[in-house]
Every structure is written in structure tokens, then in C-alpha cells.
Amino acid sequence: MMTGTIETTGNISAEKGGSIILQCHLSSTTAQVTQVNWEQQDQLLAICNADLGWHISPSFKDRVAPGPGLGLTLQSLTVNDTGEYFCIYHTYPDGTYTGRIFLEVLESSVAEHGARFQIP
């Protein structure tokens, strides 16, 4: 039975040209995390495999940095980065857990962050 839950940054906003940390956290399970996939609507951003390390898709290589931890730092944000992001946790023996983050990239100089994870 899958007992785990994923906590995410929820809905977050950031300034155009700035950076944001996409972060998820799997709790309430003793399952082993074997891999985390980060995806946007219809494309892969990155994969972090516990054994094999990071894969970053070529579309994002110039502006995605691995981490912190299993998270992902998205840099040089543009308005086109607005949208849904998914963290997909591959675990053993539970299977997969999926978390959702909505990012809004703002033109203005004021951008409020979600409450669960504070981005400095």
C-alpha cells in the first residue's frame, strides 16, 4: 500500500530573469527513493537517479542546475516558463508518487513565494 505523501512548494511566483528552486519532499513512507524525474507539461527537464546521478535535458542545460538535493534550480526565467511542473518520485517498493508545482513568472519586481519552502 502506498502511504507516502509529497509536499511541494505549491503555487510559486518569481521575477523574469531571476531563478527559482523547484522542491518536493516525500514523507510518511519508508520506501527507498530510486529516482526523481522533473517534468514540464510535455517535456522532461531532468532526472536524478540515486545511483547514476543527474541527467538534464538539452533544452534546459544552459539554465537548469541540479539541486539542492533532489530539487532543481531553474535560472534565467522567462514568461514562457510559467506553467505546471511535476516531480515524479520513483520508489521501491511503493511505486511512483507525483507532486505538482505551479510557477508564475512575473514581469514586475514583486514576486511572492509559496509558504511551504521559502526561497531566499
Epitope: 517534468e39 522532461l44 546521478g53
Partner: antibody, heavy 119, light 107 residues
Framework: QVQLVQSGAEVKKPGASVKVSCKAS????????IYWVRQAPGQGLEWMGG????????NFNENFQGRVTMTVDTSISTAYMELSRLRSDDTAVYYC????????????WGQGTTVTVSS | DIQMTQSPSSLSASVGDRVTITCKAS??????VAWYQQKPGKAPKLLIY???YRYTGVPSRFSGSGSGTDFTFTISSLQPEDIATYYC?????????FGGGTKLEIK
């Protein structure tokens, strides 16, 4: 330029083990994973697993779990794949491959090592 | 494990033809797909990855597309040197798996 040079052909009896080496040059060895792919005669490609040379971590295809060992010797930039309890259906060409920068795709390949298992 | 079903398994085409090979994943693999070319007695070569990026030195007649479960590999104008077997591969989740291959012949 990046090169992966594998050890020579082997003939083994069923139940024996084989150890194939893959000598890397032209890049910083610990910065890229080494993967192993095999191809039985007239058949397709099968991923066996990979090793992260920076820490020795391995990830295996469960089809080979318990029979395969992947190791590295960073001092000589060489990766090894050992397959034990050989069977006739392990007869294949074994390739070592290297990923792209921050990429899992197989960008560089060794020349292949033919392993024949026959009594 | 994720199965990659490639079709057709073989095809015959003429020089200059447009050739299309498809690969269907048994479950979602996002854009974590690559295509390889293998000539007899040789190691495979990476052609396309992620799944529309041409690898260094690969001619522009080779292209790829797709997302999710359905992927396409295209040779826009077949050349004699393109005679080979082509494989798709997913690296979305381990164990990474290949399609069964498409053997391409000249008519």
C-alpha cells in the same frame, strides 16, 4: 578525442565467469558514467547496467541481478564488467558506453567484446 | 519494465525516399528517448536524443520527434550509406530499454 577500448574476445564454458575491461581516454574518467550494453547474435540491444566512477555506485538491469558486477579502477581510467554463472544464451557482443555531458544517452561506444559460451 | 515497440521491423526504400520509423512506449517516458544507428559488425552510433536533438556531426536529413509514448524517427532523403539497423531507446526509468530495431534496406 574520447576513446573506449575494450579487451579481446573470450571463450568460456557454461558456469564460468568472464571479466571484460573498458579503458577510457580523452576525458576526465570520473566525470561520466560507464554503461554496459550487450547484443546476442542477430538480436537487438540490451542494457545491462551502469557504474558511476566518481563513487562506484551501480545500477543493474534486474535480468542480470546477482550475476553481474561493475567496477572501476580510477587510477587507470578503466571500467570492468564481470558476468558469472555463464549460460549459452550469454553468448553476445558486450559494449561499454559513455554518456553525454549531464546526459544518459550513449554518446560514445567501445568496439565491443565478443564472449562465446560453449561447452 | 517499459517496453519500446518499434515498427516496422524491416523496410525497403529507394535512394531519395523519405523514411519514417515509429516507436511506442508501453508507458509515459516524457522526452527521454534516443535513436541509434548500427551497421553490421559495428558498434551503434547515437543519432538523435531528447528526442529531437541531432548529435554532433549527424547529417540534417535525420530527425526525431515525439513526447509521452509516441516517437518518430525520420530520414528525409535516404542515402546509400544509411543502410543499417535503427534502434530507439528510453532512459526515463531503469532498466533502460531498447526497441527491437528496424532493418533498413535499399530497393
Amino acid at each position: 578525442q574520447v576513446q573506449l577500448v575494450q579487451s579481446g574476445a573470450e571463450v568460456k564454458k557454461p558456469g564460468a565467469s568472464v571479466k571484460v575491461s573498458c579503458k577510457a581516454s580523452g576525458y576526465t574518467f570520473i566525470s561520466y558514467n560507464i554503461y554496459w550494453v550487450r547484443q546476442a547474435p542477430g538480436q537487438g540491444l540490451e542494457w545491462m547496467g551502469g557504474v558511476n566512477p566518481s563513487n562506484g555506485n551501480t545500477n543493474f538491469n534486474e535480468n542480470f541481478q546477482g550475476r553481474v558486477t561493475m567496477t572501476v579502477d580510477t587510477s587507470i581510467s578503466t571500467a570492468y564488467m564481470e558476468l558469472s554463472r555463464l549460460r549459452s544464451d550469454d553468448t553476445a557482443v558486450y559494449y561499454c558506453t559513455r554518456g553525454n555531458y549531464y546526459g544518459y544517452e550513449f554518446a560514445y561506444w567501445g568496439q565491443g567484446t565478443t564472449v562465446t559460451v560453449s561447452s | 519494465d517499459i517496453q519500446m515497440t518499434q515498427s516496422p521491423s524491416s523496410l525497403s526504400a529507394s535512394v531519395g525516399d523519405r523514411v519514417t520509423i515509429t516507436c511506442k512506449a508501453s508507458q509515459h517516458v516524457s522526452t527521454a528517448v534516443a535513436w541509434y544507428q548500427q551497421k553490421p559488425g559495428k558498434a551503434p552510433k547515437l543519432l538523435i536524443y531528447s528526442p529531437s536533438y541531432r548529435y554532433t556531426g549527424v547529417p540534417s536529413r535525420f530527425s526525431g520527434s515525439g513526447s509521452g509514448t509516441d516517437f518518430t524517427f525520420t530520414i528525409s532523403s535516404l542515402q546509400p550509406e544509411d543502410i543499417a539497423t535503427y534502434y530507439c531507446q528510453q532512459h526515463y526509468s531503469t532498466p533502460w530499454t531498447f526497441g527491437g530495431g528496424t532493418k533498413l534496406e535499399i530497393k
